[in-house]
Interface confidence: low
């Protein structure tokens, strides 16, 4: 037989020879970093057909590193599910906690003992410093100095000194988030007042009010014979402007008899949909007449006679 087989986990006892006689036996021992667990054989014999009898290093087990418990509020996840040397231990913190220390420890061989490459990390609770103070307003728990993960504060505005109240711009509630950062910027308190929305040939059908402060919502419809150019619903935004802009009501012109009939008039009706762009609520109640979709057909405001052949 030629030289006996080599293995990852065990090595030949003694020096290998260039050839071996039939019946000759060679013995193996577990390599450094491995330990033997009976009963599997760790020897082989040169067989009559000049091959070595089957042998494997399955009896040699890798040394394993000491048990590591899950960090409090986290997990220790052994790579490949093993504590054997050469493998890693990954540490993960639960939601609301962050890792202090090494995210990965390595099971290393020191002499013949497997030990971890460092100290296991700890999972520290996510803490936030107090949220920002805001002008003309305050937040709940203002006396608290340290906030824990998902702790929330709610802002409110002070009474205004003048006739118009302060409006809270932004989300009133913010919470202590993942990276010890508040979930969003603090809101602001300021006077927001939009102009009265005037629509010629139309009328406001909801959202009536003496004044239109932040987030005031108004809906419109056009008079008979007019169609709405723009959105039927507008909102007072933080810049004291209407969003979208106040719509217009444009006159519907009569169609030509030689062309596909145009809609004679369009009267806007009240919509319950606050988002005009939403298609989920079905057809919008106010729309432009379909005549403008036909090539060569005049737009309603251009007048029919001007473009006849």
């Amino acid at each position: 037989c030629e030289e006996p087989p080599t293995f990852e986990a065990m090595e030949l006892i003694g020096k290998p020879k260039p050839y071996y006689e039939i019946g000759e036996r060679v013995d193996y021992k577990c390599k450094k970093g491995y330990f033997y667990i009976p009963p599997l054989a760790t020897h082989t014999i040169c067989d009559r057909n000049h091959t070595w009898l089957p042998v494997s290093d399955d009896a040699c087990y890798r040394e394993t590193c000491p048990y590591i418990r899950d960090p409090l509020n986290g997990q220790a996840v052994p790579a490949n599910g093993t504590y054997e040397f050469g493998y890693q231990m990954h540490f993960i913190c639960n939601e609301g906690y962050y890792l202090i220390g090494e995210e990965i420890l390595y099971c290393e061989l020191k002499g013949s003992v497997a030990i971890w490459s460092g100290k296991p990390p700890i999972c520290e609770k996510v803490l936030c410093t107090p949220p920002p103070k805001i002008k003309n307003g305050k937040h709940t728990f203002s006396e608290v100095e340290v906030f824990e993960y998902l702790d929330a504060v709610t802002y409110s505005c002070d009474p205004a000194p003048g006739p118009d109240p302060f409006s809270l711009i932004g989300e009133s509630t913010i919470y202590c988030g993942d990276n010890s950062v508040w979930s969003r910027a603090a809101p602001e308190c300021k006077v927001v007042k939009c102009r009265f929305p005037v629509v010629e040939n139309g009328k406001q059908i909801s959202g009536f009010g003496k004044k239109f402060y932040y987030k005031a919502t108004v809906m419109f419809e056009c008079d008979k014979g007019f169609y709405l150019d723009g959105s039927d619903t507008i909102v007072c935004d933080s810049n004291s402007t209407w969003d979208p802009p106040v719509p217009k009501c444009l006159k519907v012109l009569p169609p030509s008899s030689t062309k596909p009939p145009a809609l004679s008039h369009s009267v806007s009706t009240s919509s319950t949909t606050k988002s005009p762009a939403s298609s989920a609520s079905g057809p919008r109640p106010t729309y432009k007449p379909p005549v403008s979709n036909y090539p060569g057909y005049p737009k309603p405001e251009e007048g029919i006679l001007d473009s006849l052949d």
């Epitope: 330990f35 667990i37 087990y61 040394e63 394993t64 000491p66 048990y67 418990r69 409090l72 003992v113 497997a114 700890i122």
Partner: antibody, heavy 118, light 107 residues
Framework: EVQLVESGGGLVQPGGSLRLSCAAS????????ISWIRQSPSRGLEWLGV???????NYNSAFMSRFTISRDDSKNTAYLQMNSLKTEDTAVYYC????????????WGQGTLVTVSS | AIQLTQSPSSLSASVGDRVTITCRAS??????LNWYLQKPGQSPQLLIY???SLHSGVPDRFSGSGSGTDFTLKISRVEAEDVGVYYC?????????FGQGTKVEIK
Amino acid sequence: EVQLVESGGGLVQPGGSLRLSCAASGGSVSSYDISWIRQSPSRGLEWLGVIWTDGGTNYNSAFMSRFTISRDDSKNTAYLQMNSLKTEDTAVYYCERVYDGYPWFAYWGQGTLVTVSS
Amino acid sequence: AIQLTQSPSSLSASVGDRVTITCRASQGISNYLNWYLQKPGQSPQLLIYYTSSLHSGVPDRFSGSGSGTDFTLKISRVEAEDVGVYYCQQYIKLPWTFGQGTKVEIK
């Protein structure tokens, strides 16, 4: 060197409850991982559970439903609360400082005897 | 839970004798085994941790060996003060468990 002294043992009827204390002197109980171990002639040494310095706990599942380990840092004392006691819980109970975070026990107290009998 | 079985359950030796106690685990525990001695009327005391490491203050006549499932505690020359019950303990897996003990007496 911290010394641990167990107390609170005594005679209790089956089904009763008992709270054992483990007072630390010469050091802070919160600075050490504290295990509770019991010993009886019939069952030998049994590890009951541990409270770690960070306040986390691990239990021997055989006792988890009945035994609770806690700590009061202000009193510098660890506790073992035992409920629904059975006659087989009769044993000497030791509180034990875990050796530098490794699970070998180098600092045994003198133990406190708990007898469960009617 | 991992079971630890010690043998013999008791032995009697003369001062100066070599004493061997074995501890067998129900599954492989690598080298995560400790040995304790409980002298009469006292609490247990740590002798050896991690199979073969002597705890501070323990005389070097004590030695430990083994790996996997079979472990041995040897006292090279037993002395009168070595009487008591010897326990092995594994810590590879919760719950940590102890052997049933080996009682050593001096003839």
